[in-house]
Interface confidence: medium
């Protein structure tokens, strides 16, 4: 699986999950998030050669098409597969609020 | 929606579904498919600016991150959202077989 366990341990050029730390204030301008100050959102990148973690029949077909027609601009793309939530603390006035934001952390990738 | 109805009518630079005809023999080397000779598989391409058909909170965050950090390599990617099946006819010996291949035709795209 193209997950953090595999991708963070290996120098993988093809589609894989990559570490990306996002600072809420500095990178997003989100001053309203009190805790955490930032988090590892991660992201997916890298080429999708034929059959690499193909998501659907279409991505398999497109991967083969791209292999046989390398000049073509159509090819599968490396995108998030499994995502995890992130719990944040923010304030409404002086009242603290804890909320779980869904699909915030990329754990693995696929070719779609 | 970034579907064929919208994308094929408009000269849209951002993420959209694009027409792609795939000929089973010429483009894939699949000589075993008897009918159809080929089909419109289509594909997704184009930049994913902030909030454009964002698939998850992560793609929204990444889109904003990319807007504020344009030199960063992390950005959402334009990938298939809705896919449709394709019915094919092939032969096993002299026996004709009809099969529906799932997720073969891209009907719309999203930024993931």
């Amino acid at each position: 699986a193209l997950d953090t366990n595999y991708c963070f341990r290996n120098l993988e050029e093809n589609c894989c999950v990559r570490p990306l730390y996002i600072d809420f204030r500095q990178d997003l301008g989100w001053k309203w998030v009190h805790e955490p100050k930032g988090y590892y959102a991660n992201f997916c990148s890298g080429p999708c050669p034929y059959l690499r973690s193909a998501d659907t029949t279409h991505s398999t077909v497109l991967g083969l098409y791209n292999t046989l027609n390398p000049e073509a601009s159509a090819s599968p793309c490396c995108v998030p597969q499994d995502l995890e939530p992130l719990t944040i603390l923010y304030y409404v006035g002086r009242t603290p609020k804890v909320e779980q934001l869904s699909n915030m952390v990329v754990k693995s990738c696929k070719c779609s | 929606a970034l579907d064929t109805n919208y994308c094929f009518r408009n000269l849209e630079e951002n993420c959209c579904v694009r027409p792609l005809y795939i000929d089973f023999r010429q483009d894939l080397g699949w000589k075993w498919v008897h009918e159809p000779k080929g089909y419109y598989a289509n594909f997704c391409s184009g930049p994913c600016p902030y909030l454009r058909s964002a698939d998850t909170t992560h793609s929204t965050v990444l889109g904003l991150y990319n807007t504020l950090n344009p030199e960063a390599s992390a950005s959402p990617c334009c990938v298939p959202q809705d896919l449709e099946p394709l019915t094919i006819l092939y032969y096993v010996g002299r026996t004709p077989k009809v099969e529906q291949l799932s997720n073969m035709v891209v009907k719309s795209c999203k930024c993931s």
């Epitope: - | 064929t4 094929f8 027409p19 005809y21 000929d23 023999r25 010429q26 483009d27 000589k31």
Partner: antibody
Framework: QVQLVQSGAEVKKPGSSVKVSCKAS????????IHWVRQAPGQGLEWIGR????????DYSEKFQGRVTITADKSTSTAYMELSSLRSEDTAVYYC?????????????WGQGTLVTVSS | DIQMTQSPSSLSASVGDRVTITCKAS??????VAWYQQKPGKAPKLLIY???NRYTGVPDRFSGSGYGTDFTFTISSLQAEDVAVYYC?????????FGGGTKVEIK
């Protein structure tokens, strides 16, 4: 560069057959469809059929079904179009053309054309 | 079979004029339409594919648009060398039918 070179002009009697050749060069002949199109004098273009030289698979217009046979010889990179039971209305210029790589039936390279005259 | 109805059948325009040709398909062909130029005694030449994609080396005065059943081919500024017959072709399903052609002349 890609080239399609067709055989010379033919004069045929009604009821006979004609076989037009189309020699391809400059690309992998076996992996692109070859289409045949005709044009009667002063008229428009009419699609006849096509062949995939890689395995000989063919696809004909219903109008010509039963009268036309398209074949290909991979060893010489040549496609053939044979039309039988000729009548005067088959008098036309016959073109072969290659299906463009990465599109469907858009035809990017054409032969120079072969004039077939059917006359008694 | 899908019919392609092209209009006008002929037109005369001055050098520098904008010329528009239309093609109507009898059923939806999404955007699977090609446009060809044919000069007297010559084979057709591909100009546009997928309704709006200019083929390699084709001058940018030639353009195409459309989706579904209605397609348009435009020469933005007619040149003397553009005198020819122009054909549309649907490449959506076999048989790959052509329009009747439009003869373009200079006034």
């Amino acid at each position: 560069q890609v080239q399609l070179v067709q055989s010379g002009a033919e004069v045929k009697k009604p009821g006979s057959s004609v076989k037009v050749s189309c020699k391809a060069s400059g690309y992998t002949f076996s992996s692109s469809w070859i289409h045949w199109v005709r044009q009667a004098p002063g008229q428009g273009l009419e699609w006849i059929g096509r062949i995939y030289p890689g395995d000989g698979d063919t696809d004909y217009s219903e109008k010509f079904q039963g009268r036309v046979t398209i074949t290909a010889d991979k060893s010489t990179s040549t496609a053939y179009m044979e039309l039988s039971s000729l009548r005067s209305e088959d008098t036309a210029v016959y073109y072969c053309a290659r299906r463009m790589i990465t599109t469907q039936a858009a035809l990017d390279y054409w032969g120079q054309g072969t004039l077939v005259t059917v006359s008694s | 079979d899908i019919q392609m109805t092209q209009s006008p059948s002929s037109l005369s325009a001055s050098v520098g004029d904008r010329v528009t040709i239309t093609c109507k398909a009898s059923q939806s062909v999404i955007n699977a339409v090609a446009w060809y130029q044919q000069k007297p005694g010559k084979a057709p030449k591909l100009l546009i594919y997928y309704a709006s994609n200019r083929y390699t080396g084709v001058p940018d005065r030639f353009s195409g648009s459309g989706y579904g059943t209605d397609f348009t081919f435009t020469i933005s500024s007619l040149q003397a060398e553009d005198v020819a017959v122009y054909y549309c072709q649907q490449d959506y399903s076999s048989p790959y039918t052509f329009g009747g052609g439009t003869k373009v002349e200079i006034k």
